[in-house]
Amino acid sequence: AELFLIASPSHPTEGSPVTLTCKMPFLQSSDAQFQFCFFRDTRALGPGWSSSPKLQIAAMWKEDTGSYWCEAQTMASKVLRSRRSQINVHRVPVADVSLETQPPGGQVMEGDRLVLICSVAMGTGDITFLWYKGAVGLNLQSKTQRSLTAEYEIPSVRESDAEQYYCVAENGYGPSPSGLVSITVRIPVSRPILMLRAPRAQAAVEDVLELHCEALRGSPPILYWFYHEDITLGSRSAPSGGGASFNLSLTEEHSGNYSCEANNGLGAQRSEAVTLNFTVPTGARSNHLTS
């Protein structure tokens, strides 16, 4: 009796299953009690000897390429051996590499977690993923794994992490890069500082008082609110960052506490109050302000 090994599919792609069947064309396996064993090169596969003429391999990999055969043994210990069959496992080169971010859109707040997710649409086997910072490409990390995606994490983002990033994937057919992704690090405003600026050391009624509010840190645009005794005077903005000013034509009622508030949508911060007092110098007829 002759024995044949049939592999289905005969040219598997990496990661796909294969069924090995040990066939005896001129003999029904039910006619006698047979035990079957499958081999690759010199090594027995799966459970070793078994009553089933089939062996299911869940996933084939490039390193599983080799020479396969099977053996059948009767109860009388007669051993039949099939001819060797060459099984070549086909590797799919990586293609369509993309880089995505979590949070999406590449905008992340300072101190928050950023994940750069490198994905391939196609590709089998061990894929090496590499992450790079900047268009020139400072290598951040590499990971080799059997999956179509891999992650690089920055647990707490800093201002210096605002850059362009890209990733590269490769599985033996040469590197395949993703496109560039820009990361914007949004920085909440710091506590602003309020300064009062007058045209002279002792400002008088009808002088123009400039209230200048500035948060030294914070992503633009920044909106500033100006207050006198907790009453809103109005708002001004700093489209490119920095400070903003609000002008007041002084009257006697403008004596008192002034403050400002900064917000860029990531959190408001209020300045310390600055006090403006009217003083009437001896022999002077007009009121003066001091701060």
Partner: antibody
Framework: QVQVVESGGGVVQPGRSLRLSCAAS????????MHWVRQAPGKGLEWVAG????????YYADSVKGRFTISRDNSKNTLYLQMNSLRAEDTAVYYC?????????WGQGTLVTVSS | EIVLTQSPATLSLSPGERATLSCRAS??????LAWYQQKPGQAPRLLIY???NRATGIPARFSGSGSGTDFTLTISSLEPEDFAVYYC??????????FGQGTKVEIK
């Protein structure tokens, strides 16, 4: 005294457009941000759109982004809301509110009904 | 987006009783939370701003407290005109400027 008065509401068919106006008086309009807030019948308040004192920055709720446009004319002390591609779910009373930076003054509202 | 959750949805009380309304933020809004009162057919009215400051013309029976994520509006002794819907709103992080879903204070 501070006053904001909305106008321009009415009944409109789905897919059509409407422009709301908000006339402000009693304060220096060009010093304050302005917002539109809506309230569907029997529901809570929903912020719709906001604009900075000088019109330089505009913000929209996701539900209206790409369909509504907020604008202002500081020379006329007027705030606008251009509403395009209206849907049944846009049916609401639309309020305009002054930002100080709290919403300290509100208009009486104008009813927009989107119905075929 | 910061989500504001108000509780309870409805508060049934009698005039003269104390009302305690809660507003919880999904993340810190510092002290930048306001409370509004709305009566049927009327526009909302600013009651409390920056968590604890009474707006102009608001009676002393209204008080606000809290910071971070947990805020409370207290009406020490309910007057007949206080029966209304109350909303909290944050202005710390935007867009969007968000409101709570409201608490209705009704006569028991």
């Amino acid at each position: 005294q501070v006053q904001v008065v909305e106008s321009g509401g009415g009944v409109v068919q789905p897919g059509r457009s409407l422009r709301l106006s908000c006339a402000a008086s009693g304060f220096t309009f060009s010093n304050y941000g302005m917002h539109w807030v809506r309230q569907a019948p029997g529901k809570g308040l929903e912020w719709v759109a906001g604009i900075w004192y000088d019109g330089s920055n505009k913000y929209y709720a996701d539900s209206v982004k790409g369909r509504f446009t907020i604008s202002r004319d500081n020379s006329k002390n007027t705030l606008y809301l251009q509403m395009n591609s209206l849907r049944a779910e846009d049916t609401a009373v639309y309020y305009c509110a002054r930002e100080s930076p709290n919403f300290d003054y509100w208009g009486q509202g104008t009813l927009v009904t989107v119905s075929s | 987006e910061i989500v504001l959750t108000q509780s309870p949805a409805t508060l049934s009380l009698s005039p003269g009783e104390r009302a305690t309304l809660s507003c919880r933020a999904s993340q810190s809004v510092s002290s930048y939370l306001a409370w509004y009162q709305q009566k049927p057919g009327q526009a909302p009215r600013l009651l409390i701003y920056d968590a604890s400051n009474r707006a102009t013309g608001i009676p002393a029976r209204f008080s606000g407290s809290g910071s971070g994520t947990d805020f409370t509006l207290t009406i020490s002794s309910l007057e007949p005109e206080d029966f209304a819907v109350y909303y909290c709103q944050q202005r710390n992080n935007w867009p969007p400027w968000t409101f709570g879903q409201g608490t209705k204070v009704e006569i028991k």
